[in-house]
Interface confidence: low
């Protein structure tokens, strides 16, 4: 009865179970009777990250600077290169195949969460009592100025985009 299944880390060749090659190595020759599987190390710039029976190693990913990418972690014979975006940019997708500029929070919205290499800026509307008058990827909403603590009175109310305007206390007539 020919075999149809092999143990973990083995593969089937002509009804014979051969040992797979370990991560970082590719298959040169299948096992044959008493001769074990022949494997060889992946070359520089290549990798295999699993136990395998692959004839070819995979090329390391290229972190293309023209897409705003740079190498975060060098690949090895067992791992792929990981790319990340330059500062001021974030990945456009989960695979981080290219980068785009961080979004700015417009006036009236403040930064809730600063962007990272993998996530964009998260903005939040400024609540009552707070304002933002700039487009920024860093600035949170600022509290309105307290005229009273400065010994002044409110001349103009604040909005989510503008601060309160304070003025001097009106003089009392004798």
């Amino acid at each position: 009865e020919p075999r149809t299944a092999c143990r973990e880390k083995q593969y089937l060749v002509d009804s014979q179970c051969c040992n797979m090659c370990p991560p970082g190595e590719k298959l040169v020759n299948d096992c044959l009777h008493t001769i074990d599987t022949e494997c060889t190390r992946c070359q520089t710039g290549e990798f295999l990250d699993t136990w395998n029976a692959e004839r070819h190693c995979h090329q390391h990913k290229y972190c293309d600077p023209n897409l705003g990418l740079h190498v975060e972690k060098e690949g090895t014979s067992e791992t792929d290169t990981t790319c990340t975006c330059d500062e001021g940019l974030h990945c456009t997708n989960a695979a981080c195949e290219s980068c785009t500029m961080h979004s700015l929070c417009p006036p009236g919205l403040g930064v809730k969460q600063i962007a990272t290499g993998i996530s964009d800026t998260i903005c939040d509307p400024c609540p009552i009592g707070f304002f933002s008058n700039v487009s920024s990827a860093l600035e949170k909403c600022h509290p309105w100025t307290s005229c009273e603590t400065k010994g002044l009175v409110k001349v103009q109310a604040g909005t989510n985009k503008t601060d309160v305007i304070c003025g001097p206390q009106p003089r009392l007539r004798a």
């Epitope: 972190c63 023209n66 190498v71 060098e74 330059d86 600063i114 990827a137 860093l138």
Partner: antibody, heavy 119, light 107 residues
Amino acid sequence: QVQLQQSGPELVKPGASVKISCKASGYSFTSYYIHWVKQSPGQGLEWIGWIFPGSGNTKYNEKFKGKATLTADTSSSTAYMQLSSLTSEDSAVYFCARRGTTRDALDYWGQGTSVTVSS
Amino acid sequence: DILLTQSPAILSVSPGERVSFSCRASQSIGTSIHWFQQRTNGSPRVLIKYASQSISGIPSRFSGSGSGTDFTLSINSVESEDIADYYCQQSYTWPFTFGSGTKLAIK
């Protein structure tokens, strides 16, 4: 036009610290990296690290961790590098240079600051 | 760290001659190489970025080529003002590294 103006030469004693500055003008300071590079007398160029003023994030060459500290003041568009526990090995000219966030080389350089460590 | 080997250490040429500088990386770095000129007591100045991309304001006699591990900077007709040290630098990964430089001298 883009300019990086560095502080003047420094003569410091062994064991002391020094802080050198690099004032940027002519571009948006928070949108570009500032890199620092060391050039020892008669020698080549050695990369120390960068700071991105827009976020304050830094990256150091392992060789200079604990030796150099990079900071930036966005209100004055000035980057700083502090060198600590100075020895004669730290005597060198230090350059600041600008690099864009992508597709760019170190495109503008300061004139260099000479640091001499001597007792 | 990626090692950049520049050769020769000194190049001596006559004005008007073509000259080539070599830079070899210890591993494949795509086209992430930049070339700088540094005159005596001056700051480095970028000549070529990403192996072959020209830089605004740099004379057209400067050109670059190569990818992977072998890179070349060429000056197609050397002028006396080109006397300087020439460095390659990689931006493929941190830490950025520079070559040891090649000094250009005029015969």
